[in-house]
């Protein structure tokens, strides 16, 4: 169920601190605006207060979307979805956020990458990703190329390849040329998830051809 309240919350950390400590979908408000957005809040993992900005779990949602769709978000917050680059950009430019990326493979293993500093540039700068301070179990080297790249979609090619990474690998992502990750790639079912050049990739955990079973990207203020 949607959990609405008269209070205005910028992120799930504010929701958590207001006393709402149950996982679920909450209404968040854009910083310095009255515009609202629905987001899934993880109130249990690692102390709670996490705003889920991406989830892949079953292939039910098409992630080969346009620039505008990645800008405003798509999918279902209770399942597979992308929260929206514009909201995340505005949010992460207000204060310091951490980004946690949780990954599952098809063999029952889980891993994570935690970045102590995360923000997205404005749309004018193509929602370039900025990351620092990597820790975690999903590789000592960042699978999101650093320094960060501009976001690219099938209709917005900002990568560093003469090819068009988003069209070739599918999905919108911070492609390099084309780089060691793409968590918005084509969902591949079990036993069809190896040797996939266009799958859900996190190179420094599972290598280049392995397509993951599930991914979650979540953010939280660093001072939570």
């Amino acid at each position: 169920d949607y959990k609405d309240d008269d209070d205005k919350f910028r992120d799930c950390a504010e929701v958590f601190k207001s006393g709402h400590t149950t996982n679920g979908i909450y209404t968040l408000t854009f910083p310095n605006s009255t515009e609202e957005i629905k987001a899934y809040c993880d109130m249990e993992a690692g102390g709670g207060g996490w705003t889920i900005i991406q989830r892949r779990e079953d292939g039910s949602v098409d992630f080969q979307r346009t620039w505008k769709e990645y800008k405003v978000g798509f999918g279902n917050p209770s399942g597979e979805y992308w929260l929206g680059n514009e909201f995340v950009s505005q949010l992460t430019n207000q204060q310091r956020y951490v980004l946690k990326i949780h990954l599952k493979d098809w063999e029952g293993n889980e891993a994570y990458s935690l970045y102590e500093h995360f923000y997205l540039s404005s749309e004018e700068l193509n929602y370039r990703i900025h990351l620092k301070g990597l820790t975690g179990t999903a590789g000592k080297i960042s699978s999101i190329s650093q320094p960060g790249n501009d976001f690219s979609t099938k209709d917005g090619d900002n990568d560093k390849c003469i090819c068009k990474c988003s069209q070739m690998l599918t999905g919108g992502w911070w492609f390099d040329a084309c780089g060691p990750s793409n968590l918005n790639g084509m969902y591949a079912p079990q036993r069809q998830n190896t040797n996939k050049f266009n799958g859900i990739k996190w190179y420094y955990w599972k290598g280049s051809g392995y397509s993951l079973k599930a991914t979650t990207m979540m953010i939280r203020p660093a001072d939570f």
Partner: antibody, heavy 121, light 107 residues
């Protein structure tokens, strides 16, 4: 291409304030990244002094925190260093530089050519 | 603050030699280490970032490696124009700190 240019007096008297300007061309200082001041002492030791981010937030080296201020003039695409109560130990070449991350310290990819400042009476 | 101890202070080499400079951090700097080259009369120039990534336009004879506390910078085949001072810098924690520099002199 991004260019940074420092300017300011080459000689400052002890106990006075040192004021320097960094003029940036080829990139808006409000768009992204952090804009730093670094100094190099005689003998080549480098010290990061602080930055002002594209959003206007500042971060300073704790060793200078009581004496330093970094501000900006967005209309002129300039940022400034003010260092108060200088002593001869503040004699150095002062550089402005852009770092590759906007909300925290990072490596610096564009540097000015530096301006030499001597503190002496 | 993280202290970056850089060795050696001076390297006297011939053109064509391979040289290695090391930096040891007083505590973990993850892979948030950069290397700079400063030629006489010039400002520092970024060569390597995130310990091992070559900055745009930097020749591939310059390489970096390391993680945690131990970092290495190498020039595979020294050329005359590599005469400079080389600095490491950590930016894992604030304030960012630099090594003391290694002066490379050509015989």
């Amino acid at each position: 291409d991004v260019q940074l240019q420092e300017s300011g007096p080459g000689l400052v008297k002890p106990s006075q304030s040192l004021s320097l300007t960094c003029t940036v061309t080829g990139y808006s200082i409000t768009s992204d990244y952090a804009w730093n001041w670094i100094r190099q002492f005689p003998g080549n030791k480098l010290e990061w002094m602080g930055y002002i981010s594209y959003s206007g937030s500042t971060s300073y080296n704790p060793s200078l925190k009581s004496r330093i201020s970094i501000t900006r003039d967005t209309s002129k695409n300039q940022f400034f260093l003010q260092l108060n109560s200088v002593t001869p130990e503040d004699t150095a070449t002062y550089y402005c530089a852009r770092s590759t991350f906007g909300h925290y310290v990072s490596s610096m990819d564009y540097w000015g050519q530096g301006t030499s400042v001597t503190v002496s009476s | 603050s993280i202290v970056m101890t850089q060795t050696p202070k001076l390297l006297l080499v011939s053109a064509g030699d391979r040289v290695t400079i090391t930096c040891k951090a007083s505590q973990s700097a993850s892979n948030d280490v950069a290397w700079y080259q400063q030629k006489p009369g010039q400002s520092p120039k970024l060569l390597i970032y995130y310990a091992s990534n070559r900055y745009t336009g930097v020749p591939d004879r310059f390489t970096g490696s390391g993680y945690g506390t131990d970092f290495t910078f190498a020039i595979s085949t020294v050329q005359a124009e590599d005469l400079a001072i080389y600095f490491c810098q950590q930016d894992y924690s604030s304030p960012p700190t630099f090594g003391g520099g290694t002066k490379l002199e050509i015989k």
